[in-house]
């Protein structure tokens, strides 16, 4: 009769985390009499996974009835697989004795564990940045196995190329993490833009995971100011408006100054939203020209989103007063200038 062989038909088995792994093993003979043991690894540090004869192995069940008299199938199922279970498993036949002695081993089955990556988390810079500036976004995903993974960046559906990605650890681990940093150049139209990090992994069956960041949380579009003089509303009164255009976010405070002295301060409230997500706002000031002996410098000063104030000025000539309503001769717009006020 031919000598017993231990057959492990699967060289490798891949299982998703949380599932059960079936490790196949058959023997070709009932002789010699003796139990089967399963080990993870080989050599003096191998770990006993299952002993047919004795012991308690709560995660291991036999696939067939191993206690049957003529049973030659010693396949096992290991439940609730985690990445820590990866390794090479050996089915080993022992010869009955005192003690039992190892008789023959199977060739081993390598168990690899597939674990899904966590949903990618995208985070942007701590402080807002203005258009034309380059900002960095990071994307992180954890807990996946095997190590091979693909990460892509998109801005509004367009793939980005300026990014660096690391998978850690460099060596072997039960599971891995990915960290990527992408550089994005902001434009004035980016209030409604999204940055997307897309992660593809063997466990996702071609349906990648995505993490997003809205550029509305990153961008600051500074306002443009325009100060204009409106037709006279009444005798000795001039209406001056400050148009604050294309700003984001909404947080804005406007101060009117007459010859450098604060006249009124207000906070933007009833703003209008542009298609690109930026806001417009208008403030007006009624100036009593007769109260001034000399020319008046009117300044619209805007502090946007906690940034240093920007301003626009308008000179009102008071040398000749308007004769009738609607006349624009006495208060000509003699030009404006823009300056920072610190």
């Amino acid at each position: 009769e031919e000598e017993l062989q231990v057959i492990q038909p699967d060289k490798s088995v891949s299982v998703a985390a949380g599932e059960s792994a079936i490790l196949h093993c058959t023997v070709t003979s009932l002789i010699p009499v003796g139990p089967i043991q399963w080990f993870r690894g080989a050599g003096p540090a191998r770990e006993l996974i299952y002993n047919q004869k004795e012991g308690h192995f709560p995660r291991v069940t036999t696939v067939s009835e191993s206690t049957k008299r003529n049973n030659m199938d010693f396949s096992i199922s290991i439940s609730n697989i985690t990445p820590a279970d990866a390794g090479t498993y050996y089915c080993v036949k022992f010869r009955k004795g005192s003690p039992d002695t190892e008789f023959k081993s199977g060739a081993g089955t390598e168990l690899s564990v597939r674990a899904k990556p966590s949903a990618p988390v995208v985070s942007g810079p701590a402080a807002r940045a203005t258009p034309q500036h380059t900002v960095s976004f990071t994307c992180e995903s954890h807990g996946f196995s095997p190590r091979d993974i693909t990460l892509k960046w998109f801005k509004n559906g367009n793939e980005l190329s300026d990014f660096q990605t690391n998978v850690d650890p460099v060596g072997e681990s039960v599971s891995y993490s990915i960290h990527s940093t992408a550089k994005v150049v902001l434009t004035r139209e980016d209030v409604h833009s999204q940055v997307i990090c897309e992660v593809a992994h063997v466990t996702l069956q071609g349906d990648p995971l995505r993490g997003t960041a809205n550029l509305s949380e990153t961008i600051r579009v500074p306002p443009t100011l325009e100060v204009t003089q409106q037709p006279v509303r009444a005798e000795n009164q001039v209406n001056v408006t400050c148009q604050v255009r294309k700003f984001y976010p909404q947080r804005l405070q406007l101060t009117w100054l007459e010859n450098g002295n604060v006249s009124r301060t207000e906070t933007a409230s009833t703003v209008t939203e542009n298609k690109d997500g930026t806001y417009n706002w208008m403030s007006w000031l009624l100036v009593n020209v007769s109260a001034h002996r000399d020319d008046v410098k009117l300044t619209c000063q805007v502090e946007h989103d906690g940034q240093p104030a920007v301003s626009k000025s308008h000179d009102l000539k008071v040398s000749a007063h308007p004769k009738e309503q609607g006349s624009n001769t006495a208060a000509e717009n003699t030009g404006s200038n823009e300056r920072n006020i610190y």
Partner: antibody
Framework: QVQLQESGPGLVKPSETLSLTCTVS????????WSWIRQPPGKGLEWIGF???????FYQSSLKSRVTISLDTSKNQFSLKMTSVTAADTAVYYC????????????????WGQGTTVTVSS | DIVMTQSPLSLPVTPGEPASISCRSS???????????LDWYLQRPGQSPQLLIY???SRASGVPDRFSGSGSGTDFTLKISRVEAEDVGVFYC?????????FGQGTKVEIK
């Protein structure tokens, strides 16, 4: 193909601790034993100990009280620490990979580092 | 501990001629599975040792077929069918059945 590279100080003072690191490149840590072996000048090979990928360690009984081998799979490195060194610990120290195919024994030390000379002297 | 004893300790050889080295272990290296846990190594001058034979008789990857290992139990032999100049160095036998791993004292092979 797998390569091993030892690193660490070449000179250690008596009574101090010898620390060596072996970096594994081009291969897997899993399913192998990672060994330290030394060779005193003009003498034969002496096994110090090894560590399996699951973290279990085995040491030469005469060195056991002074030796610790550790494994950092995340960096693909394993290390040797030997305390209270004397001149008798002067040797070329090799890191090596030991194969285990099945069974209780091992299947040859098939990959060796180039060796690093450690001199114990004040 | 298993003690490994080699002979001869020095072996002058002629290129093209055969050579053999003996190794004896203080206990059997034949395991119950029928596997023999005996390895042979060659350490060329100024180099690290390299594995020649494992399992008593299996040649390691890349080892020329002029090297062969035989024996079982406690007595083992390494044979070189035709010695070449590059074979000079120290040959070691080692047991891998149990810890501590142990090596023979080494056999120094040099050209006559």
């Amino acid at each position: 193909q797998v390569q091993l590279q030892e690193s660490g100080p070449g000179l250690v003072k008596p009574s101090e601790t010898l620390s060596l690191t072996c970096t594994v490149s081009g291969g897997s840590i899993r399913d192998y034993y990672w060994s330290w072996i030394r060779q005193p000048p003009g003498k034969g090979l002496e096994w110090i100990g090894f560590i399996y990928y699951n973290g279990r360690t085995f040491y030469q009984s005469s060195l056991k009280s002074r030796v610790t081998i550790s494994l950092d799979t995340s960096k693909n490195q394993f290390s040797l620490k030997m305390t209270s060194v004397t001149a008798a610990d002067t040797a070329v120290y090799y890191c090596a990979r030991v194969r285990a195919y099945s069974g209780i024994g091992l299947d040859g030390t098939d990959v060796w580092g180039q060796g690093t000379t450690v001199t114990v002297s004040s | 501990d298993i003690v490994m004893t080699q002979s001869p300790l020095s072996l002058p050889v002629t290129p093209g001629e055969p050579a053999s080295i003996s190794c004896r272990s203080s206990q059997s290296l034949l395991y119950s599975t029928g596997y023999t846990y005996l390895d042979w190594y060659l350490q060329r001058p100024g180099q690290s040792p390299q594995l020649l034979i494992y399992g008593g008789s299996s040649r390691a990857s890349g080892v020329p077929d002029r090297f062969s290992g035989s024996g079982s139990g406690t007595d083992f032999t390494l044979k070189i069918s035709r010695v070449e100049a590059e074979d000079v160095g120290v040959f070691y036998c080692g047991q891998a059945l149990q810890t501590p791993l142990t090596f023979g004292q080494g056999t120094k092979v040099e050209i006559k």
